[in-house]
Interface confidence: low
């Protein structure tokens, strides 16, 4: 059985294809190749005569075809027009003809694709975006990549138009990409340059920094406002509801207690039309917003009951503070034997009794802050009672 085989079957444009012949009969006069599925003299490519070992170009010869003595046909520099069927007719010595038909497919070397978009500046949670991979070519597979990865499964991603169009439903700020499309055919593949989306969003609720609430008079107040937004938000400041300025930063030098109040940052995105505000309370006070931990000291920590007295002192470097004392979680003084002096910095117990043994600590505080000392332990001992008979033991 006479057969033909295309090597290769899928050919890149500009390359060559060899139509191989198998089971060629013996005792031949010659053979001819034709373009198409049947023998048609007008579509003869080349004929070969065994006796003269000479090939004769036919009407369909383009100058790119070479016939070999084994009847194989080489077609060089193929074009897409060469795609299709080729028929070999063998003329045997008994004048009986045999035919075999083969085919091959020529694919173009694919160009570098590009991505077009129906909306390059979509609004978050509102707009959809359709990407289209260009050009549209036949017999081409279209693939998409997001962040160099194949498409994730997502209800917001839709492929259509033979996978040539990728639609993002309800874009988010995380959908910036990059996006790439790849086109493939059996002989080549090519990927587009990456495309990124400029997703318009925000502003989110602004953040005012630093987070400090308390400031001392004479300090400089410097507040900065930031809200995630694309395009970047436009900012304005209000103090106690009164507009101050349209800047991202608010600076007030040498503040006084009169600068206390509510500070509002207003963020606006002119594209989305959205606004967000954040209010921060600022307190300007001489009081320390952070009271340091006080130190507690005892004149002695082990005393004799009903005999000794003890002085506990609470030390602090902070000014404008008050001091209070605690014993076993109870506020002091709790008896007439306990006295506070020197602005409550000293707690005196005179005399000390058994029930005074335990843990003491002090707390310093102002209207906006407080801090307590580490505890101190007071031990109360009693001397051994004298012998009732006055005699020494033994």
């Amino acid at each position: 059985q006479l057969t033909t085989e295309s090597m290769p079957f899928n050919v890149a444009e500009g390359k060559e294809v060899l139509l191989l012949v198998h089971n060629l009969p013996q005792q031949l006069f010659g053979y001819s190749w034709y373009k198409g599925e049947r023998v048609d003299g007008n579509r003869q490519i080349v004929g070969y005569a065994i006796g003269t070992q000479q090939a004769t170009p036919g009407p369909a010869n383009s100058g790119r075809e070479t016939i070999y003595p084994n009847a194989s046909l080489l077609i060089q520099n193929v074009t897409q027009n060469d795609t299709g069927f080729y028929t070999l007719q063998v003329i045997k010595s008994d004048l009986v003809n045999e035919e075999a038909t083969g085919q091959f497919h020529v694919y173009p070397e694919l160009p570098k694709p590009s991505i077009s978009s129906n909306n390059s500046n979509p609004v978050e949670d509102k707009d959809a975006v359709a990407f289209t991979c260009e050009p549209e070519t036949q017999d081409t597979t279209y693939l998409w990549w997001i962040n160099n990865q194949s498409l994730p499964v997502s209800p917001r991603l839709q492929l259509s138009n033979g996978n040539r169009t990728l639609t993002l439903l309800s874009v988010t700020r995380n959908d910036t990409g990059p996006y790439e499309c790849e086109i493939q055919n059996p002989v080549s593949a090519n990927r587009s340059d990456p495309v990124t989306l400029n997703v318009t969003y925000g502003p989110d609720t602004p953040t005012i920094s630093p987070s400090d609430t308390y400031y001392r008079p004479g300090a400089n107040l410097s507040l900065s406002c930031y809200a995630a937004s694309n395009p970047p938000a436009q900012y304005s400041w209000l103090i106690n509801g009164t507009f101050q300025q349209s800047t991202q930063e608010l600076f007030i030098p040498n503040i006084t207690v009169n600068n206390s109040g509510s500070y509002t940052c207003h963020a606006n995105n002119s594209v989305t039309g959205c606004n967000r505000t954040t209010v921060k309370t600022i307190i300007v006070t001489e009081l320390s917003p952070v009271v340091a931990k006080p130190q507690i000291k005892a004149s002695k920590t082990t005393v004799t009951g009903d005999k000794d007295s003890v002085n506990l002192t609470c030390s602090t470097n902070d000014t404008g503070i008050s001091i209070r004392w605690f014993f076993k979680n109870q506020s002091l003084p709790s008896s007439e034997r306990m006295k506070l002096s020197q602005g409550n910095t000293t707690l005196s117990i005179n005399p000390v009794k058994r029930e005074d043994a335990g843990t003491y600590w002090c707390e310093v505080f102002n209207p906006i802050s407080k801090n307590q000392s580490d505890p101190i332990m007071l031990n109360v001992n009693y001397n051994a009672l004298p012998q009732e008979n006055g005699l020494s033991p033994g």
């Epitope: 444009e13 500009g14 390359k15 070479t66 070999y68 080489l74 074009t79 027009n81 173009p108 070397e109």
Partner: antibody, heavy 118, light 113 residues
Framework: QVQLVQSGSELRTPGASVKVSCKAS????????LSWVRQAPGQGLEWMGW????????TYAQGFTGRFVFSLDTSVSTAYLQISSLKAEDTAVYYC???????????WGQGTLVTVSS | DIVMTQSPDSLAVSLGERATINCKSS????????????LAWYQQKPGQPPKLLIY???TRESGVPDRFSGSGSGTDFTLTISCLQAEDVAVYYC?????????FGQGTKVEIK
């Protein structure tokens, strides 16, 4: 790696013949055509023609028919250029060059200087 | 036959400067079926065989530095060396492989100024 190694320099008298060889290695010899290019002293490049290494079929450029013969010995992956009836104007460096898949000559032999002098 | 004409015949360029060589073909070498220009550029240094630099008029051969670039279409083509190096001193040839006989330009000698 692909290499085309040509035979050494030749000195001939007018009327004599010379045969230059070009041995290929590093690829399938019969898959790529081989061209011959001439470069006369101080002159440019002149394409002489090529030989189909699959069929052995040579193609000669105008001016290189008759005295010039391209041939092959595929068993040793070698192409030959034979010039007969040498003339003084045949003095030149002769290059073999592989016809790349796209057509241009992607690999060249080192060249063979043929000097024709009485 | 297609005649290839290069200009200039020689040029001297300072190191680091741009060198531009032109090549004109007497017939169109653009193949409309694949939109390829069947034109190549070669570099030949003294005592060496030519080396393929560019094919399809603008595609750099593997391993060729990117300071070499080709452009043009149809009948007018250009080889540009964007930043001339000392090792670029050579004769440069264009060649059409659109139709037989394949033909070369006469060559352009590039020297250091």
């Amino acid at each position: 790696q692909v290499q085309l190694v040509q035979s050494g320099s030749e000195l001939r008298t007018p009327g004599a013949s010379v045969k230059v060889s070009c041995k290929a290695s590093g690829y399938t010899f019969t898959s790529y055509g081989l061209s011959w290019v001439r470069q006369a002293p101080g002159q440019g490049l002149e394409w002489m023609g090529w030989i189909n290494t699959n069929t052995g079929n040579p193609t000669y450029a105008q001016g290189f028919t008759g005295r010039f013969v391209f041939s092959l010995d595929t068993s040793v992956s070698t192409a030959y250029l034979q010039i007969s009836s040498l003339k003084a104007e045949d003095t030149a460096v002769y290059y073999c060059a592989r016809k790349g898949i796209w057509g241009p000559f992607d690999y060249w032999g080192q060249g063979t200087l043929v000097t024709v002098s009485s | 036959d297609i005649v290839m004409t290069q200009s200039p015949d020689s040029l001297a360029v300072s190191l680091g400067e741009r060198a531009t060589i032109n090549c004109k073909s007497s017939q169109n070498v653009l193949y409309s079926s694949n939109n390829k220009n069947y034109l190549a550029w070669y570099q030949q240094k003294p005592g060496q065989p030519p080396k393929l630099l560019i094919y399809w008029a603008s595609t750099r051969e593997s391993g060729v530095p990117d300071r070499f670039s080709g452009s043009g279409s149809g009948t007018d083509f250009t080889l540009t060396i964007s930043c001339l190096q000392a090792e670029d001193v050579a004769v440069y040839y264009c060649q059409q492989y659109f139709s037989s006989p394949w033909t070369f330009g006469q060559g352009t000698k590039v020297e250091i100024k």
